[in-house]
C-alpha cells in the first residue's frame, strides 16, 4: 500500500511540477521592471524567454517576439534549451510512469518491468527538474548581473543637461513558478525512485511448498533457487519467505475477479 | 460614438472647493482611463491628473493636496474635486480620455471655472 | 517634473509653406521596452478643445492629414507641416506622457501674415 501510494503521489507531485515548467517557459514575466526607486513611468515593461511586452497605464499591452535566433543573448538561448529539455524529458517521463503505475495493469507486465520503468521515470523527472532550476537560475543569475550594472550608471548624463533613465529590470513572477516547479518535479522523481526500491523483489516471493520424500524431506523452492534440505530447521512444512518481514505492496499479487485494467 | 461631457458650477468663490463631473459615453470607464487637463486664459495646457481603468489615480505635483479624481462606473462618470480655489484656478477645465500611447484622443468641450468673490 | 520646451512660441507663414516646431524635454521619453518614444502632440483652434494629431512620437492618429508628421527620439521632437493650409493655424502642444505627471509644453501659435 505504501509504495503504490508513494508512487501515486511521485506521479502526481512531478505532473504538477511539469506543468508548472510548461507555465513558466511560456509566461512573459521572466523579468518584470524595477519600480523600486525609479521614477514613475506610464509605462511598465516586461520580458519573458520569447517575447518583451510593454503595458502602458492606458491599459493597452503590446508585446513583440524576438524573431531573431543569432541576435540573442546566449545565456537566453541556453535558458530556453534547459527549460526545453526539461519539459522533454518530464513529458517522456510521465508517458513512461503512467504505463508504471502499480494500480494500473497492462496485460502481463510484470513487477520488474514496472520497477525498472518507475525507475526511469524518476530519473527523467529529477533530470528535468534540475534543468528547470538550472534554467531559472542562470537567468536569475543574469539580472541580478545586468541590475547591478545598469544601476552603476543608471543615469547617463549628456552634457550634464538631459538624463536618460535606464530601465533597471527584477525578477519576474516566472522565475518563482520555475523554481517551485522544477523543485516538485524533483521531489516527484525522488519519490518514484523510493517507490521503485519497493517495487523490485530482492527475491521472488513465492510461497515455498514441502515435498516430504521417503526418507528426508526437501523443501523445494520454485524458480531456479537454491534448495533448501530439510534436516533440522524447516521439518515441519512451514512457509519459506526470502527473508525479513515486507509490506502487502511487496508480496506479488495475482489477478483476481476484482481486479479492474 | 465617443463623447466626454464636463458640468460644473461655473463660479466659485476663493478658498471654496470646486466639483466637476465628467460624463462620458461610447466607452466604458473599466477600459479606458480619464484625464483632468485645465487651461487658464490664453494660457497653456495644465495636466490635472488621471484616473486609470483599474481605478488607480496620478496627480499633478504642484496639485496632489487639494486634488482628488474619483469615478461611477455605473454611471460612467468621472468627477474632479479641488479644494482651497485661488483665482489663478480661473480656467477651462476638460476632461479626455486616454488611449494608445498614454495620449488623448477624445476631449469634452471644457466647462469654464471663474474664481471671484 | 519633465520641462517640456517648445520653440519657437510663435510662427508666421503663408499658405502652402513648410512648417518645422520643435519640443524638447528635459528627460528622454524613450522606452527601451518598446523603442518608443512617448510624446505626443496636439493641435488646438480658437475656442476649441485641443485635437490629438500624433502619438508615440511619429504616429498619426486617424483622420489627421498625411501633412503633419511627427518625428524624434528620446529628448528632441519634431512636428512638420509639410503644406500649411488655413485650417492649420492654431496653437500646437507637445505633451510628455511617459513621466508623471503628465506635462505640456507651452505651445507654438501658428499665425499667418
Known amino acids: 500500500m505504501a509504495v503504490t501510494a508513494c508512487q501515486g503521489l511521485g506521479f502526481v507531485v512531478s505532473l504538477i511540477g511539469i506543468a508548472g515548467i510548461i507555465a513558466a517557459t511560456c509566461m512573459d514575466q521572466w523579468s518584470t521592471q524595477d519600480l523600486y526607486n525609479n521614477p514613475v513611468t506610464a509605462v511598465f515593461n516586461y520580458q519573458g524567454l520569447w517575447r518583451s511586452c510593454v503595458r502602458e497605464s492606458s491599459g493597452f499591452t503590446e508585446c513583440r517576439g524576438y524573431f531573431t535566433l543569432l541576435g540573442l543573448p546566449a545565456m537566453l538561448q541556453a535558458v530556453r534549451a534547459l527549460m526545453i529539455v526539461g519539459i522533454v524529458l518530464g513529458a517522456i517521463g510521465l508517458l513512461v510512469s503512467i504505463f508504471a503505475l502499480k494500480c494500473i495493469r497492462i496485460g502481463s507486465m510484470e513487477d520488474s518491468a514496472k520497477a525498472n520503468m518507475t525507475l526511469t521515470s524518476g530519473i527523467m523527472f529529477i533530470v528535468s527538474g534540475l534543468c528547470a532550476i538550472a534554467g531559472v537560475s542562470v537567468f536569475a543569475n543574469m539580472l541580478v548581473t545586468n541590475f547591478w550594472m545598469s544601476t552603476a550608471n543608471m543615469y547617463t548624463g549628456m552634457g550634464g543637461m538631459v538624463q536618460t533613465v535606464q530601465t533597471r529590470y527584477t525578477f519576474g513572477a516566472a522565475l518563482f513558478v520555475g523554481w517551485v516547479a522544477g523543485g516538485l518535479t524533483l521531489i516527484g522523481g525522488v519519490m518514484m525512485c523510493i517507490a521503485c526500491r519497493g517495487l523490485a523483489p530482492e527475491e521472488t516471493n513465492y510461497k515455498a511448498v514441502s515435498y516430504h520424500a521417503s526418507g528426508h524431506s526437501v523443501a523445494y523452492k520454485p524458480g531456479g533457487f537454491k534448495a533448501s534440505t530439510g534436516f533440522g530447521s524447516n521439518t515441519k512444512n512451514k512457509k519459506i519467505y526470502d527473508g525479513g518481514a515486507r509490506t502487502e505492496d511487496e508480496v506479488q499479487s495475482y489477478p483476481s475477479k476484482h481486479d479492474y485494467v | 460614438q465617443v463623447q466626454l461631457k464636463e458640468s460644473g458650477p461655473g463660479l466659485v468663490a476663493p478658498s471654496q472647493s470646486l466639483s466637476i463631473t465628467c460624463t462620458v459615453s461610447g466607452f466604458s470607464l473599466t477600459s479606458y482611463g480619464v484625464s483632468w487637463v485645465r487651461q487658464p486664459p490664453g494660457k497653456g495646457l495644465e495636466c490635472l491628473g488621471v484616473?486609470?481603468?483599474?481605478?488607480?489615480?496620478n496627480y499633478n505635483s504642484a496639485l496632489m493636496s487639494r486634488l482628488s479624481i474619483s469615478k461611477d462606473k455605473s454611471k460612467s462618470q468621472v468627477f474632479l474635486k479641488m479644494n482651497s480655489l485661488q483665482t489663478d484656478d480661473t480656467a477651462m477645465y476638460y476632461c479626455?480620455?486616454?488611449?494608445?500611447?498614454?495620449?488623448?484622443?477624445?476631449w469634452g468641450q471644457g466647462t469654464s471655472v471663474t474664481v471671484s468673490s | 517634473d519633465i520641462v517640456m520646451t517648445q520653440s519657437p512660441s510663435s510662427l508666421t507663414v503663408t499658405a502652402g509653406e513648410k512648417v518645422t516646431m520643435s519640443c524638447k524635454s528635459s528627460?528622454?521619453?524613450?522606452?527601451?521596452?518598446?523603442?518608443?518614444?512617448?510624446l505626443t502632440w496636439y493641435q488646438q483652434r480658437p475656442g476649441q478643445p485641443p485635437k490629438l494629431l500624433i502619438y508615440w512620437a511619429s504616429t498619426r492618429e486617424s483622420g489627421v492629414p498625411d501633412r503633419f508628421t511627427g518625428s524624434g527620439s528620446g529628448t528632441d521632437f519634431t512636428l512638420t507641416i509639410s503644406s500649411v493650409q488655413a485650417e492649420d493655424l492654431a496653437v500646437y502642444f507637445c505633451q510628455n506622457v511617459y513621466f508623471f505627471p503628465f506635462t505640456f509644453g507651452s505651445g507654438t501659435k501658428l499665425e499667418t501674415k
Open positions: 479626455a480620455r486616454v488611449y494608445y500611447g498614454n495620449a488623448m484622443d477624445y
Open positions: 528627460q528622454s521619453l524613450l522606452n527601451s521596452g518598446n523603442q518608443k518614444s512617448y
Open positions: 484616473i486609470w481603468a483599474g481605478g488607480n489615480t
